[in-house]
Interface confidence: medium
């Protein structure tokens, strides 16, 4: 069950999933003067048997340097129109996939890929927060917020996190 | 249950660095949040900063910036603590220690790294 | 930046005595206190989390009170290896600061 909304936003903060269940969506997104292949994958999915998870297709850009540059939108898939955005960092090397059965690693990233990350997450995804540099926690945790499902809708909980310039 | 396990003891000279290493077992080691704590002899408890290893950026503890570097390397579970410009008073018993979060306290500790700083 | 103050900063007692130490903080850190037991030589060891909540595995005549800016620590009963040194600690806010410590010793 895809989450309705995007996680909390807490000024000043970024949010970041550690490892993403089954089920979890990421746009193909490329950057500024690229475009999606002919024919490619509108977005990776995290999906697995109990023992193991992995993103399912690809994503691949090309240079649009013939159309026009303006930015791409990528079509959204039908069951979810929310943007829920990371920011692009460096591929860290992930938990043990042991620890975290029917959940997928943060994906590599691919070539001329957007900064910005737009997944759609699913019910029981967790995500944690942390005050941007210059910025500082008050009320230190909990720093997490959770896709919950209750009464039919789905909803996230609120983390406990100020952050004071 | 995870253990931290921290590097061995130092001894170093005035004006040098030490780096001191904490590898996490037994449990997922991003989530959480990893501190950094020292203990001169017969003193209490100081808080140097911190670092969550899915975000990989660092908190200092005003008195220590700029002569602290804290990281971490999810690859091997690890977190590193490095104190430049070493002097006399220094010398402490270092520790990391995980918080979940910041709000459940620091439940896992490692089992210390003594640094002395003696010419 | 949260200022914490221990008191006493030192205790004689004997086993079987209920002791307690108390923990101001300079400002309101709601119920953001943990506790922990230090013993020579050791690394500390988490006794109370939250102002109240007992860490798994500790025994239960640790007990911890408070909200705001005061806070109590109490061992109903004294056990032999209960003498130690303890420390209070806010998670309220960067940066987290322990209270002086608190050194337990047997009369």
């Known amino acids: 069950e895809l989450c309705d909304d995007d996680p909390p936003e807490i000024p000043h903060a970024t949010f970041k999933a550690m490892a993403y269940k089954e089920g979890t969506m990421l746009n193909c997104e490329c950057k500024r003067g690229f475009r999606r292949i002919k024919s490619g994958s509108l977005y990776m999915l995290c999906t697995g048997s109990s023992s193991h998870s992995s993103w399912d297709n690809q994503c691949q850009c090309t240079s649009s340097a013939t159309r026009s540059t303006t930015k791409q939108v990528t079509p959204q898939p039908e069951e979810q129109k929310e943007r829920k955005t990371t920011e692009m960092q460096s591929p860290m090397q992930p938990v043990d996939q042991a620890s975290l059965p029917g959940h997928c690693r943060e994906p590599p990233p691919w070539e001329n890929e957007a900064t910005e990350r737009i997944y759609h997450f699913v019910v029981g995804q967790m995500v944690y927060y942390q005050c941007v540099q210059g910025y500082r926690a008050l009320h230190r945790g909990p720093a997490e917020s959770v896709c919950k499902m209750t009464h039919g809708k789905t909803r996230w909980t609120q983390p406990q996190l100020i952050c004071t310039g | 249950q995870m253990q931290l396990v921290q590097s061995g003891a130092e001894v170093k000279k005035p004006g040098s660095s030490v780096k001191v290493s904490c590898k996490a077992s037994?449990?997922?080691?991003?989530?959480?949040?990893i501190s950094w704590v020292r203990q001169a002899p017969g003193q209490g408890l100081e808080w140097m900063g911190g670092?969550?290893?899915?975000?990989?950026?660092?908190n200092y503890a005003q008195k220590f910036q700029g002569r602290v570097t804290i990281t971490a390397d999810e690859s091997t579970s690890t977190a590193y603590m490095e104190l430049s410009s070493l002097r006399s008073e220094d010398t402490a018993v270092y520790y990391c220690?995980?918080?979940?979060?910041?709000?459940?306290?620091?439940?896992?500790w490692g089992q210390g790294t003594t640094v002395t700083v003696s010419s | 930046d949260i200022q914490m103050t221990q008191s006493p900063s030192s205790l004689s007692a004997s086993v079987g005595d209920r002791v307690t130490i108390t923990c101001r903080a300079s400002?309101?850190?709601?119920?953001?206190l943990n506790w922990y037991q230090q013993k020579p030589g050791k690394a500390p060891k988490l006794l109370i989390y939250?102002?109240?909540s007992l860490q798994s595995g500790v025994p239960s005549r640790f007990s911890g009170s408070g909200s705001g800016t005061d806070f109590t620590l109490t061992i109903s009963s004294l056990q032999p290896e209960d003498f130690a040194t303890y420390y209070c600690?806010?998670?309220?806010?960067?940066?987290?600061?322990f209270g002086q410590g608190t050194k337990l010793e047997i009369k």
């Open positions: 220690a995980r918080e979940m979060y910041y709000y459940y306290g620091m439940d896992v």
């Open positions: 037994g449990g997922t080691f991003s989530s959480y949040a």
């Open positions: 670092i969550i290893p899915i975000f990989g950026t660092a």
């Open positions: 400002q309101s850190i709601s119920s953001y």
């Open positions: 939250a102002a109240s």
């Open positions: 600690q806010q998670s309220y806010s960067t940066p987290p600061a």
